[in-house]
């Protein structure tokens, strides 16, 4: 069962399975629900009637009751992960912690202006996971104003101690905040030849990768493949660091694979959530449990409603014993991963699937895409709403996407005129417009954020946040588009579709079935050909046929542009403009999101 | 058919900078890792840089290391090497090719020749 | 790094001939071996990879062989358009290193 407030003045006895040090019983929290076997913890605050050494502490710990006995002790805080939760969990952490010293590998030291210069400079370092920043008030006079970058091998500081007159933060990167690089290439029969920080058994290349970016000290990595002809080290994942934070070398090898940790562009990739089944494979590991299971399917969602259950190994039934069930191996391990990998068994492995709200609910894959034809069907763009006004009367007024359980994402343009967010209502999960009757749930509108920019459409800027009055429960028909990340700047999308209830040509009417079509992006060089008298920027981007045919038209604005790249489908561009709809040498213009990542986080992440 | 074609190069005095470029057709560029490969008038081939995919990642050799920087533009198809603090021993024949998964130069570029002389 | 030294610098032979060039790694390289050929003024051209895979579109009078440091290049009843020059790189780790190339020439 969930709980999630915490337990003050109280301390959980035994169970004990590692200590850490955080800044507060929340960040405490946070970092139990992400250990793999964490299920309750016990943090002690600072207080006087506490040994200094023990503020601070966290205390990992794990019960296969999933409970412990409580202990009434002062200071003590404690509390259960949120593995047991079903809402979305995220590591990102913006709190900054006032005369604190939070502590580590002291490896760059600097001056910066402010604390939050020295929350960015860490956020964009490769290696940092936390500072310290010395403020102007700090006794010290050559120190003050210095931020401190620090690392940990747990991501964790070694110890926290006061010290008046500094404050200390973690890195943003968990909270998609971080420029840096992410280098989505797999290298094939390669070995990354740098110091190993930890290794770890996967079934493949793609969930070594996902254990490298979230580990913390993890920013490449080595994979050996079930063909790598030592037999001992088949499916293992070599988790490496280096000083420059890449590789010094490449060496070919046969049958090895090796990438890097994009934990910089994490949230718009499923890390934690291995979702894929592992035919004629074993997983080997700590058993839970032996349950009896009609398909792997079955033995996968039994694994992922026992909290302990990391992994499973399933053994479909001999001809027709155990009424045609097979027998579902539940299993954990000290690290979340097989302990051992075997093949030509005749298993049927795979993950737990508890772990994948710890993923932004955008990375979960959708329908396949219906080929073919113009009109949608129900479900093939979960992200797409439909914004109506009431005044003077109920019409659509403009597209828009779900980028968050709060937050719609469309166009600043939809809003001239529009003199309240109360004449505003969000339809989700709509695939005909004359679905929506008198009755008809929709949300309403508690925001209306546009950019400070804004003008007008052709000069850029055309952004809008639309902050909803309650939140939206996801549903196949109703779910997030990732925002592209900061870090996929280089990425060419190739797949591209534009959505919207639009006009099909310039002079028409709003269409009843949500409209798709596919438009290739164009570069913003042919683009400013195109646009003469317009200032294409790189804050745009724009998308069409060089013989037109097809386009955004009225009524598509704010709608998405939506991209899929590696599986997952990436809001690109935002309908703004055009010179007619779907002419010749004339693209769509759309506002080029990533360009906007920072804005939408700034407002959507607002405490 | 792949095409790589190679321009910028010229004279330049010692000291100085050039910017080569290498536009590719004929293939998906934002798939392959590219290189510069050079060759010094009568000599061997000598291999320059390398940029992965998606451009995070690039390799020198000690040679140019701290002078030259590779990078490349996916949604233009094309290829960049930045040289600077140019000397005398720089001046080649300088190739644009694909690195492939063989870890072999797949396809080459008709190179452009940087001299570098006063 | 790794040293590669082709040997030898130079060859000459006839139409219809068999030629042997060798190439010798200053390490152990496996059969991370890449063979070219360059006519000249023009850019190089790859023959073989992974010490004996033939490149698409390769003859088949080409051949290479050998593992561990030692490696040769064969080309059996050599054409005219054969003679130019040759070099080994080598494929096993970053910095690539090539060879000083070995010309062939017409006897």
């Known amino acids: 069962e969930c709980v999630t407030q915490l337990l003050k003045d109280t301390c959980f006895e035994g169970g004990d399975i590692t200590t850490v040090f955080t800044p507060s019983a929340k960040y405490c929290q946070v970092v139990c629900t992400y250990h793999p076997r964490c299920l309750l913890f016990t943090f002690t605050a600072e207080s006087p009637s506490e040994d200094p050494t023990r503020w601070f502490t966290c205390v990992l710990k794990d019960s296969v009751t999933e409970t412990l006995p409580r202990v009434n002790r002062t200071a003590a805080i404690s509390g259960y992960s949120f593995k047991q939760c079903s809402h979305q969990i995220s590591a990102c952490n913006k709190d900054i912690y006032v005369d604190l010293d939070m502590k580590g590998i002291n490896y760059n030291s600097s001056v910066a202006k402010s604390a939050q210069e020295c929350q960015e400079r860490c956020t964009d370092d490769v290696h940092c996971h936390f500072f310290t920043y010395a403020t102007r008030q700090f006794p010290s006079l050559e120190h003050r104003n210095i931020c401190l970058l620090k690392h940990t091998q747990t991501g964790t500081p070694t110890r926290i101690t006061k010290l008046d007159k500094v404050v200390s933060g973690f890195s943003l990167k968990s909270c998609a905040l971080s420029n840096l690089a992410c280098i989505r290439d797999i290298f094939p029969n390669t070995v990354f030849a740098d110091s190993n920080i930890d290794s770890v058994m996967a079934p493949d290349a793609f969930v070594c990768g996902r254990i490298c970016t979230h580990h913390p000290g993890c920013l490449f990595f080595t994979f050996f493949s079930q063909e790598w002809p030592k037999e001992s080290q088949r499916n293992l994942c070599l988790l490496k660091t280096s000083e420059s934070g890449l590789p010094s070398t490449r060496i070919k090898k046969s049958k090895a694979l090796s990438g890097f940790s994009l934990q910089s562009c994490r949230h718009s990739i499923p890390v934690f959530c291995h979702s894929s089944f592992y035919h004629d494979t074993d997983f080997l590991g700590e058993e839970l449990d032996i349950v009896a299971a009609k398909s792997h399917e079955a033995c996968q969602k039994l694994c992922t409603n026992a909290v302990r259950c990391q992994f499973f190994t399933y053994t479909p039934a001999q001809a027709s014993c155990n009424e045609g069930k097979g027998k579902c191996y539940l299993k954990l391990s000290s690290n979340g991963s097989p302990t051992k990998i075997l093949h030509g068994r005749g298993g049927i492995s795979g993950y737990t699937l508890r772990l994948c709200k710890m993923d932004n609910e955008c990375t979960t894959k959708i329908k396949p895409r219906i080929v073919g034809g113009t009109a949608s069907v129900r479900g093939e763009w979960p992200w797409q709403v439909t914004l109506h006004t009431t005044s003077p009367t109920q019409r659509h007024l403009c597209g828009g996407s779900i980028i968050g359980n709060q937050w719609i994402l469309t166009a600043a343009h939809c809003f001239y005129g529009v003199e309240s967010p109360k004449i505003l209502r969000v339809y989700s999960g709509i695939l005909n417009q004359s679905e929506i009757k008198e009755d008809t749930s929709f949300f309403g509108v508690q925001e209306i954020i546009i950019h400070d920019q804004y003008k007008m459409a052709e000069s850029g800027y055309d952004i809008a946040l639309l902050k909803l009055e309650t939140t939206v429960n996801y549903t196949d028909s109703q779910r997030p588009i990732c925002l592209p990340s900061k870090g996929d700047r280089n990425v060419i999308y190739t797949d591209c579709w534009v959505t919207g209830w639009g006009y099909r040509k310039l002079r028409d009417k709003i269409q009843n079935t949500l409209q798709k079509a596919k438009i290739p992006l164009v570069t913003n060089e042919e683009c400013q050909k195109r646009y003469r008298g317009h200032k294409i920027t790189h804050k745009m981007i724009c998308a069409g046929y060089r013989e037109g045919g097809k386009d955004a038209c009225k009524g598509d604005s704010g709608g998405p542009l939506s991209c899929k790249h590696n599986e997952v489908w990436h809001l690109v561009g935002i309908t703004s403009w055009g010179e007619g709809c779907a002419q010749r040498e004339r693209p769509g213009v759309y506002t080029n999101v990533v360009e906007y990542v920072d804005w939408i986080l700034e407002k959507t992440q607002a405490v | 058919e792949v095409q790589l074609l190679e321009s910028g190069g010229g004279l330049v005095q010692p000291g100085g900078s050039l910017r080569l470029s290498c536009a590719a057709s004929?293939?998906?560029?934002?798939?392959?890792?590219m290189a510069w490969v050079r060759q010094a008038p009568g000599k061997g081939l000598e291999w320059v840089s390398s940029?992965?995919?998606?451009?995070?990642?690039?390799l020198y050799a000690d040679s140019v290391k701290g002078r030259f920087t590779i990078s490349r533009d996916n949604s233009k198809n094309t290829l960049y090497l930045q040289m600077n603090s140019l000397r005398a021993e720089d001046t080649a024949v300088y190739y644009c090719?694909?690195?492939?998964?063989?870890?072999?130069?797949?396809?080459w570029g008709q190179g452009t020749l940087v001299t570098v002389s006063s | 790094d790794i040293q590669m030294t082709q040997s030898p610098s130079s060859v000459s032979a006839s139409v219809g001939d068999r030629v042997t060039i060798t190439c010798r790694a200053s390490?152990?390289?496996?059969?991370?071996l890449a063979w070219y050929q360059q006519r000249p003024g023009k850019a190089p051209k790859l023959l073989i990879y992974?010490?004996?895979t033939l490149q698409s579109g390769v003859p088949s009078r080409f051949s290479g062989s050998g593992s561990g440091t030692d490696f040769t290049l064969t080309i059996n009843s050599l054409q005219p358009e054969n003679f130019a020059t040759y070099y080994c790189?080598?494929?096993?780790?970053?910095?690539?290193?090539f060879g000083q190339g070995t010309r062939l020439e017409i006897k």
């Open positions: 090719a694909t690195w492939g998964d063989s870890w072999g130069f797949d396809f």
């Open positions: 390490q152990g390289i496996s059969s991370w």
């Open positions: 004929g293939f998906t560029f934002s798939d392959y890792e």
């Open positions: 790189q080598q494929a096993d780790s970053f910095p690539i290193t």
């Open positions: 992974d010490a004996s």
């Open positions: 940029i992965v995919p998606s451009g995070g990642w690039t």
